[in-house]
Interface confidence: low
């Protein structure tokens, strides 16, 4: 969890002299608690926005959006602690709008934003925004949460975000599977624009998909500088055992920019449906998934089996 | 020039906490796992834990699992690890360690000693 | 979990002798194995990745070699500065186990 890297951040508006200030997310008001507080936050809002770096990088970024209740407890109002959790890491960012003037009734709703907290893709996060002076111990809680969803790397807007192209997300290998005779398989990928090394992984499943029989990896070394965009093919010798024959396969690249952590893409070809004229056919039916990143260096184990080649269609 | 400079060791005594810390410099940071490993004295290497670029993935070895976490701050190029329950065989040079694409570890910081001891 | 042994513990040889070691894994980890060279009071090096290639800057007489379950380090023509202790480590899942370790001294 970040701030994004540029510009002052502001929070002034008219009628309203505000300064945005870094916060440890323990505000004074809750060590030494006031008698009179401000009523809670309301139509808190959270929407996914994008927003460029001086260095021309472009984020993913919580905009986060709220209104205050048309009370006299504005009166009290000296600020808001905006904070946000990243739920799977328990990790917390926290900034501060200290108001430096009194704010005053005036005909329209008095309405805050800020746009600076970058998020990560595919990350759950809770945006909480607390007026304060925080409340007394007991009093009325005066905050409002929101949980926000980032869309994953598959999403239109986020697959051109900085940290999405970093993983990966522009390449579509566009992998396609085909069963031959002799208990073999057949995957095809396109390669991408990069001299890259690339881990092709098969995982045997039995038809019920609970029960691994067969794992195997198989690497391509880095393609030369005219392989880039041709497809490569790795056959993969599979179980004998007739019932092993629901199979998951990734394909990993070591893209520079993501090395270890890259988008993986896999498809999953289920078990044939046994019919009295069973042929070796390419697979039509198998399913694309988008694999999540994934702490490489975890690979599967070889033990040896199966044969490997792959060769470039030019 | 590729760096990384452990700190935060020192003399604990069993059931205490410590946080190692590791920065990182002369490198993309946020594009690399990360591994902890250690050394008792006169022994070998030990891996201890190991932590993907975004923190999506992360292993312990058994003898540290529930006791230590790893985590990291790719925006201050820094790597850590809050050892909590510390025990005598805790005791040993922790090294925080970058893996190389295509396997193994290619950059080691210098060290960072625990020692555990009533 | 997979276990690394390493043989032997130490050895003893001769300046510009052939060393080998040896490195073994319970079961099968393809060519996912690294070696490494740990001088006394230094931080470990990589040596050897993916079973057999050498890192840059690591001088030519030193080799890997096997695939699987069986794997070597070979010494062309040991020198004073390889006095040290030799790591082999699998890659392939978690735990990323380190083997024990052979002491290599000259005699």
């Known amino acids: 969890l970040r701030l994004l890297d540029h510009r002052a951040l502001v929070c002034s508006q008219p009628g309203l002299n505000c300064t945005v200030k870094n916060s440890t997310c323990l505000d004074d008001s809750w060590i030494h608690p006031r008698n009179l507080t401000p009523s809670s936050p309301k139509d808190l809002q959270i929407q996914l926005h994008f927003a460029h770096t001086q260095q021309g990088d472009l984020f993913p970024v919580a905009h986060i959006e709220w209104t205050l209740q048309t009370d006299a407890s504005i009166l009290y109002l000296e600020g808001a602690e905006l904070s946000v959790l990243q739920l799977n890491t328990n990790e917390r960012l926290c900034v501060k709008f200290q108001f430096l003037s009194m704010l005053q009734h005036h005909r329209k709703r008095w309405r805050f934003s800020f746009s600076h907290f970058v998020v990560d893709p595919g990350q759950e996060y809770e945006v909480t925004v607390h007026h304060l002076p925080k409340p007394i111990p007991d009093g009325d809680p005066n905050h409002q949460s929101k949980n926000f969803l980032v869309p994953d790397c598959e999403h239109a807007r986020m697959k051109v975000t900085t940290p999405c192209m970093s993983s990966g997300s522009l390449w579509d290998p566009n992998i396609t599977v085909e069963t031959l005779e002799a208990h073999q398989l057949r995957v095809s990928f396109t390669l991408w624009n990069e001299s890259t090394p690339y881990q092709v992984l098969l995982e045997s499943f039995s038809d019920s998909e609970n029960h691994s029989c067969f794992d195997v990896v198989k690497q391509i070394f880095a393609p030369r500088q005219e392989e880039f965009h041709q497809r490569a093919n790795v056959t993969f010798t599979l179980s004998k055992f007739h019932w092993c024959c629901h199979h998951h396969v990734q394909v990993q690249p070591f893209f520079s920019s993501c090395l270890n952590d890259c988008l993986r893409h896999a498809v999953t070809v289920p078990c044939p449906v046994i019919s009295n004229t069973t042929v070796p056919k390419p697979v039509a039916d198998y399913i694309p998934l988008w694999e999540p990143r994934s702490g490489s260096s975890d690979y599967k184990d070889d033990d040896d089996k199966g044969s490997s080649h792959h060769h470039h269609h030019h | 020039e590729v760096q990384l400079v452990e700190s935060g060791g020192g003399l604990v005594q069993p059931g205490g906490s410590l946080r190692l810390s590791c920065a990182a410099s002369g490198f993309t940071f946020s594009s690399y796992s990360m591994n902890w490993v250690r050394q008792a004295p006169g022994k070998g290497l030990e891996w201890v834990s190991f932590i993907s670029a975004r923190s999506s993935t992360i292993y312990y070895a058994d003898s540290v699992k529930g006791r230590f976490t790893i985590s990291r701050d790719n925006a201050k190029n820094s790597l850590y690890l809050q050892m909590n329950s510390l025990r005598d065989e805790d005791t040993a040079v922790y090294y925080c360690?970058?893996?190389?694409?295509?396997?193994?570890?290619?950059?080691w910081g210098q060290g960072t000693t625990v020692t555990v001891s009533s | 979990d997979i276990q690394m042994t390493q043989s032997p513990s130490s050895l003893s040889a001769s300046v510009g002798d052939r060393v080998t070691i040896t490195c073994r894994a319970s079961q099968g980890i393809s060519n996912y194995l690294a070696w490494y060279q740990q001088k006394p009071g230094k931080f470990p090096e990589l040596l050897i990745y993916?079973?057999?290639t050498l890192q840059s800057g690591v001088p030519s007489r030193f080799s890997g070699s096997g695939s699987g379950t069986d794997f070597t380090l070979t010494i062309s023509s040991l020198q004073p500065e390889d006095v040290a202790t030799y790591y082999c480590?699998?890659?392939?899942?978690?735990?990323?186990?380190f083997g024990p370790g052979t002491k290599v001294d000259i005699k």
């Open positions: 993916a079973a057999s």
């Open positions: 360690a970058r893996p190389k694409v295509g396997g193994g570890m290619d950059v």
């Open positions: 480590q699998k890659y392939n899942r978690a735990p990323f186990t």
